[in-house]
């Protein structure tokens, strides 16, 4: 049964999905393959801590060690990448903290920004000085192992020089890499000595070798690409938001809820209210009012703005976000001060009603 009574019959489903949402990633922990990773559960006063990865119970094994509030992963592999959560169970409530683990050496070889000015990679030689190919920027080639989430773009670079100017070709797993070898093909930017593959899929896994050659010699360099598959997940809310706030009577205040969701998120701002002098209905459930929700008639749903506040506006405000997979919510308190008191930012506290996670 639902855990609240709505004060008014508000249509909760958006008539049409909003076109754009800002998304905020949870904290990301990065480790190189083979490294050990230790993460501390950032929750206080936990009687019992349980861990999950992509929504599935995480138990100790020969590589995963769970000690108190610490999670240790020994000899990390790309398969350890994913959405992790620790849940602190207390006597009266529970709280969950999310973080991402990305086991990777690098997302791409060199930065995309370099493509706007690749002059330093394209070395012009004096026509008299014949020279075999050589690498001009080995720093951009140090990362050999690339673990990349599926659907991302990958760029491998082999900046080189030589005289005459060498040519570059690419091999996949030691064989000529042809456009028809992958859906969507690939791009080669010769002036930047780069290979670009968009929207990578697991079949793109393998060794990619650039062969740079002229009549005086040939050099090569091999990258290994691993494509990490993803799983859909329920919304994630940025920790600490919305933040507690205080203002004077007649003042304005904003609550912000940063949402990370692969799928269309539906955002609701909810407040505990009183009806006929009571905070609870005859069924014992609290009365809640939906103040704002995402939909075609709603501007930026991640922000709840309150203007010309009164003392009646004081209380708890809940940002509740759902998608087809599940829900997440966080709340904050508004303190309304008499006019003579100056407002200040309050120390943030975690405040969740018992029926919300």
């Amino acid at each position: 049964r639902p855990s609240f009574s709505l004060v008014e019959d508000t249509t909760l489903e958006p008539e049409e999905p909003p076109t754009k949402y800002q998304i905020s990633q949870p904290e990301v922990y990065v480790a190189a393959p083979g490294e050990s990773l230790e993460v501390r559960c950032l929750l206080k006063d936990a009687a019992v801590i349980s861990w999950t990865k992509d929504g599935v119970h995480l138990g100790p094994n020969n590589r995963t060690v769970l000690i108190g509030e610490y999670l240790q992963i020994k000899g990390a592999t790309p398969r350890d990448s994913g959405l992790y959560a620790c849940t602190a169970s207390r006597t009266v409530d529970s709280e969950t903290w999310y973080f991402m683990v990305n086991v990777t050496d690098a997302i791409s070889s060199g930065d995309d920004e370099d493509d706007t000015d690749g002059a330093e990679d394209f070395v012009s030689e004096n026509s008299n000085n014949k020279r075999a190919p050589y690498w001009t920027n080995t720093e951009k080639m140090e990362k050999r192992l690339h673990a990349v989430p599926a659907a991302n773009t990958v760029k491998f670079r082999c900046p080189a020089g030589g005289n005459p100017m060498p040519t570059m070709r690419w091999l996949k797993n030691g064989k000529e890499f042809k456009q028809e070898h992958r859906i969507g093909g690939y791009k080669v930017r010769n002036q930047h000595w780069s290979l670009i593959m968009e929207s990578v899929v697991p079949s793109d896994k393998g060794n990619y070798t650039c062969v740079v050659e002229n009549e005086y010699g040939s050099i090569n360099h091999t990258y290994h690409l691993d494509v990490v598959e993803r799983s859909p997940h329920r919304p994630i809310l940025q920790a600490g938001l919305p933040a507690n706030a205080s203002t004077v009577v007649g003042g304005d205040v904003e609550f912000v809820c940063k949402v990370y969701s692969d799928a269309q998120p539906h955002i609701q701002w909810i407040k505990h209210v009183e009806k006929n002098g009571s905070k609870y209905g005859p069924d014992g459930l609290p009365y809640l009012k939906v103040l704002k929700h995402s939909g075609i008639n709603s501007s930026n749903a991640e922000v709840l703005a309150l203007f010309n506040v009164t003392e009646a506006d004081a209380g708890e405000y809940i940002c509740k976000v759902s998608n087809y997979i599940g829900q997440a919510n966080q709340s904050a308190w508004l303190t309304v001060l008499p006019k003579q008191q100056a407002p200040g930012r309050e120390k943030e506290i975690t405040a969740s009603p018992d029926y919300l996670e």
């Epitope: 049409e16 999905p17 799983s231 269309q264 998608n323 997979i325 599940g326 829900q327």
Partner: antibody, heavy 114, light 107 residues
Framework: QVQLVQSGAEVKKPGSSVKVSCKAS????????VHWVRQAPGQGLEWIGS????????SYNQNYKGRATITADKSTSTAYMELSSLRSEDTAVYYC???????WGQGTLVTVSS | DIQMTQSPSSLSASVGDRVTITCKAS??????IAWYQQKPGKAPKLLIY???YRYSGVPSRFSGSGSGTDFTFTISSLQPEDIATYYC?????????FGQGTKLEIK
């Protein structure tokens, strides 16, 4: 491993009700919606509704509003879908699915016949 | 409700063929589309979510693309075990609606 195990086949009279159960294991039951989808013989898939077990929030296809009731019991990690005022066209296989639709129950055949 | 129009309703192809199924949404759904495979007497199996993400363990010959209202599902090289009915579904706005299905047969 993740599993959704549904109750067995049912034969019902028109006008009666049926309650199908879906017991979840292998994941945190309260962290995912549970969806109910039905499929009439030789037909396509139709979403009935869903519930978020942690707080009981439910959402329904208007075609079933008032006739379908979806509930969840956190203590047993079980979701239920009750369909009332049954008619012959409700004869179908009823599936439960985890929120991401990545895991489905085996299906429950409900036959409505006089 | 968002209507999902899937085509063709049935198709016959040979092993090794490239097979394409399309799905059109009556309203924009961003990339909130999933594709399922269903074999007779079995529950649907998730292949693609969020239009183009292959679900874990799904063979790489299955792919999806598209955004907004027009979506495509492709099997790059048809295998005998791919004989099934395929459904698209929008998971942007409730009620989450499915296409009417495409029955795939081997020539």
């Amino acid at each position: 491993q993740v599993q959704l195990v549904q109750s067995g086949a049912e034969v019902k009279k028109p006008g009666s009700s049926v309650k199908v159960s879906c017991k979840a294991s292998g994941y945190i039951f309260t962290s995912y919606n549970v969806h109910w989808v039905r499929q009439a013989p030789g037909q396509g898939l139709e979403w009935i509704g869903s519930i978020y077990p942690d707080n009981g929030d439910s959402s329904y296809n208007q075609n079933y509003k008032g006739r379908a009731t979806i509930t969840a019991d956190k203590s047993t990690s079980t979701a239920y879908m009750e369909l009332s005022s049954l008619r012959s066209e409700d004869t179908a296989v009823y599936y439960c699915a985890r929120g991401d639709f990545a895991y489905w129950g085996q299906g429950t055949l409900v036959t409505v016949s006089s | 409700d968002i209507q999902m129009t899937q085509s063709p309703s049935s198709l016959s192809a040979s092993v090794g063929d490239r097979v394409t199924i399309t799905c059109k949404a009556s309203n924009g759904v961003s990339n909130d589309i999933a594709w399922y495979q269903q074999k007779p007497g079995k529950a649907p199996k998730l292949l693609i979510y969020s239009a183009s993400y292959r679900y874990s363990g799904v063979p790489s010959r299955f792919s999806g693309s598209g955004s907004g209202t027009d979506f495509t599902f492709t099997i790059s090289s048809l295998q005998p075990e791919d004989i099934a009915t395929y459904y698209c579904q929008q998971h942007s706005t409730t009620p989450y609606t499915f296409g009417q299905g495409t029955k795939l047969e081997i020539k």
